[in-house]
Every structure is written in structure tokens, then in C-alpha cells.
Interface confidence: medium
């Protein structure tokens, strides 16, 4: 899984799956996550605190999959069959960035370097697992 800043080695083997507790990330199509996440947060509380900064953007509705995309990084899907957190695929990130970055720029916030789409898998395959956009956001 080649995702640079998103360190796939974090959480390898040791950490078990845990229920998603972050309010923004409930009801998005999966309910188990694993910490540390892909951004290095060691607890859901820590992840939720940073994720809260995106709440206005999610509420604005610049992209229907923004919430799912953010949650895939801050509270990535966990399954006992795979030892690493599973992020979103790159196209979902690129579409969210394309539509949401202009709104962020209006308020003098650039798209965060930590959400660099280029480091996400291009598509889901056995060697680089990632989540495609859900059919119903």
C-alpha cells in the first residue's frame, strides 16, 4: 500500500478492530476501524478533534463523498482479514479536492498536505487495497 505520509505500517498486526465512535464517521458503510490511523493519530478522540475542523466543509456539501473520504483516513475501515488500515482510493480524493479546495481557499485554507491524493492507491486491487466511492453517500 503506497501512501507516503499515510503510513500503512502503522497498526500492522498488533491493534485489533474497534467500533467507530467518531460521530461524523458513523453510518458511512462500515463500523469497524483501527488505530493508529493513516495520519498517525493513536486514538479516535485525537482523530475526532482534528476531523472536527472539516465539519463546516462537510456541512457545506461541496462533495457528497467528502465525509466518507475523510473518515477513510481518520477512521479507516478495519477487517480481521487485513492487517493494515484501508484508505479511500485516489479518484475519490481527487474529486473531493477538486470540488472542495475552492471553498477552503475562499476562507484562506489550502488543501492540507496530509491529504495528498497522489499517495493513495489508484484503484482497489489485492496488492493495494482501497475503498471505492460508495453507491449511496
Amino acid at each position: 500500500l503506497e501512501i507516503g505520509r499515510f503510513d500503512p505500517e502503522r497498526g500492522r498486526g498488533a491493534a485489533p478492530c474497534q467500533a467507530v465512535e467518531i460521530p461524523m464517521c458513523r453510518g458511512i458503510g462500515y463500523n469497524l476501524t483501527r488505530m493508529p490511523n493513516l495520519l498517525g493519530h493513536t486514538s479516535q478522540g485525537e482523530a475526532a478533534a482534528e476531523l472536527a475542523e472539516f465539519a463546516p466543509l462537510v456541512q457545506y456539501g461541496c462533495h457528497s463523498h467528502l465525509r466518507f473520504f475523510l473518515c477513510s483516513l481518520y477512521a479507516p475501515m478495519c477487517t480481521d482479514q487485513v492487517s493494515t488500515p484501508i484508505p479511500a482510493c485516489r479518484p475519490m480524493c481527487e474529486q473531493a479536492r477538486l470540488r472542495c479546495a475552492p471553498i477552503m481557499e475562499q476562507f484562506n485554507f489550502g488543501w492540507p498536505d496530509s491529504l495528498d491524493c497522489a499517495r493513495l492507491p489508484t484503484r482497489n486491487d489485492p496488492h493495494a487495497l482501497c475503498m471505492e466511492a460508495p453507491e449511496n453517500a
Epitope: 461541496c62 479546495a101 475552492p102 481557499e105 484562506n108
Partner: antibody, heavy 124, light 113 residues
Framework: QLQLQESGSGLVKPSQTLSLTCAVS??????????WSWIRQPPGKGLEWIGS???????YYNPSLKSRLTISVDTSKNQFSLKLSSVTAADTAVYYC????????????????WGQGTLVTVSS | DIVMTHTPLSLSVTPGEPASISCRSS????????????LDWYLQKPGQSPQLLIH???HRASGVPDRFSGSGSGTDFTLKISRVEAEDVGVYYC?????????FGQGTKVEIK
């Protein structure tokens, strides 16, 4: 009335770096709702989007050029710049700078202002 | 990348007559989030920079005469000029901005008979 003016070397040797600057007048490059773009047009051919930058420094590059491309912005000088390394004859083109407008309420987006273009020839 | 294809590539029109240019995209340009179709038309007059004619499928840019209109849906788009005038000569380009990299069609050259 917003104006964009490209400047830079008109002749670049193969393998060297092409450098262009776009000076923006009649408006602030730091205004929200816009990104600032480079587009090129090889002689007698169509248009190709190169990349864009916001005043914050966030960039969007065409993947076909990304490995050789750097776009930067200098808000204090109200200008943005293009650097394209390791050029070949295929990079010979008229290079345009343009403003890409984005309306956050409607989602409408388009290139609304263009520079007059500058011809860059890659030749030894 | 999304491929944009023009037909015809050149067009010779009598002044006062209508003209129609088609553009096809390799995937849908409709954004289901906001309902917008991200297809624009630009005109490049001889020796000039491109200028916006139509944005977001059918919205005329400021100062563009109402003889220009844009229509279409999904992957098939049309630019119509109800009555061609001498000043309409040049190359017309469609462009998509639904997905990076933004891409242009190869252009349709319009000349006056």
C-alpha cells in the same frame, strides 16, 4: 479590468528549464474564488492545460508534465510562475496564463481571463 | 484522462446561416453532486487568445451575443450559432472541468464562405 501578462525566455535549449512569469494587474491574485493557470498551444495545434495554483500555494498539475513541472505564486508581487525542466522540441508552444474562476455557490467554473500568450521555442 | 472529440474539424458557413459544432466526451460530464455539467466552449479568433463563450453547458459568458447557445447532456454536446457573422471565424474548443486533468477538444475551425 483584469489583465494577465506573460514574460520570460522565448528561446530555450533542449534539456534546459523553461521559465515564465505571469503578472496580474487590475485585481489581486489573493482574491478568493480563483485559481491561476498555465495552458499551452503547440504551433497549429490545440490547447493543453498545464497546471494551476491557488494563492495559498496549493497546486494542481497535469500528470503528463508533473515530474518536470513547478508552478509557484508570489502574492507580494501579484504574479505566478511556471518552470518546466528538461525541455524538448515537443515543449515548443505558445504559453498562456489564465484565471480559472470558481463560484462556490453554484459550482460554475471556467477560464474567464487569459494573457495574450508568449511563444517559447525549444531549439539548440 | 477524459478525451474530448470535435465534429466536424472544419466548417465553412455562409454569413447569416446557422452553424452547429459537436463535441463528445469519453465519460459523462454531469456532476451528480451539484447537477452541473462541466462543459465549456471557447473561441480562439485568428492571432488572439481563447475567449469564453459558454460555460457549464449552456450559460453564455458576459458580453457573448445571444446567437450563441450551448446544449447537450452526459457525453454529447452542441454549440449552435443561429446566424453566423464574419466576426465568428476562428477555432472553437470544448473543454471539460469535471475531472483533472482538464482537457480540451482538438478544435473546430470555422470559416466564412
Amino acid at each position: 479590468q483584469l489583465q494577465l501578462q506573460e514574460s520570460g525566455s522565448g528561446l530555450v535549449k533542449p534539456s534546459q528549464t523553461l521559465s515564465l512569469t505571469c503578472a496580474v494587474s487590475g485585481g489581486s491574485i489573493s482574491s478568493g474564488g480563483y485559481s491561476w493557470s498555465w495552458i499551452r498551444q503547440p504551433p497549429g495545434k490545440g490547447l493543453e492545460w498545464i497546471g494551476s495554483i491557488y494563492h495559498s500555494g496549493s497546486t494542481y498539475y497535469n500528470p503528463s508534465l508533473k515530474s518536470r513541472l513547478t508552478i509557484s505564486v508570489d502574492t507580494s508581487k501579484n504574479q505566478f510562475s511556471l518552470k518546466l525542466s528538461s525541455v524538448t522540441a515537443a515543449d515548443t508552444a505558445v504559453y498562456y496564463c489564465a484565471r480559472f474562476y470558481y463560484d462556490i455557490l453554484t459550482g460554475y467554473s471556467y477560464f474567464d481571463y487569459w494573457g495574450q500568450g508568449t511563444l517559447v521555442t525549444v531549439s539548440s | 484522462d477524459i478525451v474530448m472529440t470535435h465534429t466536424p474539424l472544419s466548417l465553412s458557413v455562409t454569413p447569416g446561416e446557422p452553424a452547429s459544432i459537436s463535441c463528445r466526451s469519453s465519460r459523462s460530464l454531469l456532476d451528480t453532486d451539484d447537477g452541473n455539467t462541466y462543459l465549456d466552449w471557447y473561441l480562439q479568433k485568428p492571432g488572439q487568445s481563447p475567449q469564453l463563450l459558454i460555460h457549464t453547458l449552456s450559460h453564455r459568458a458576459s458580453g457573448v451575443p445571444d446567437r450563441f447557445s450551448g446544449s447537450g447532456s452526459g457525453t454529447d454536446f452542441t454549440l449552435k450559432i443561429s446566424r453566423v457573422e464574419a466576426e465568428d471565424v476562428g477555432v472553437y474548443y470544448c473543454m471539460q472541468s469535471i475531472q483533472l486533468p482538464w482537457t480540451f477538444g482538438q478544435g473546430t475551425k470555422v470559416e466564412i464562405k
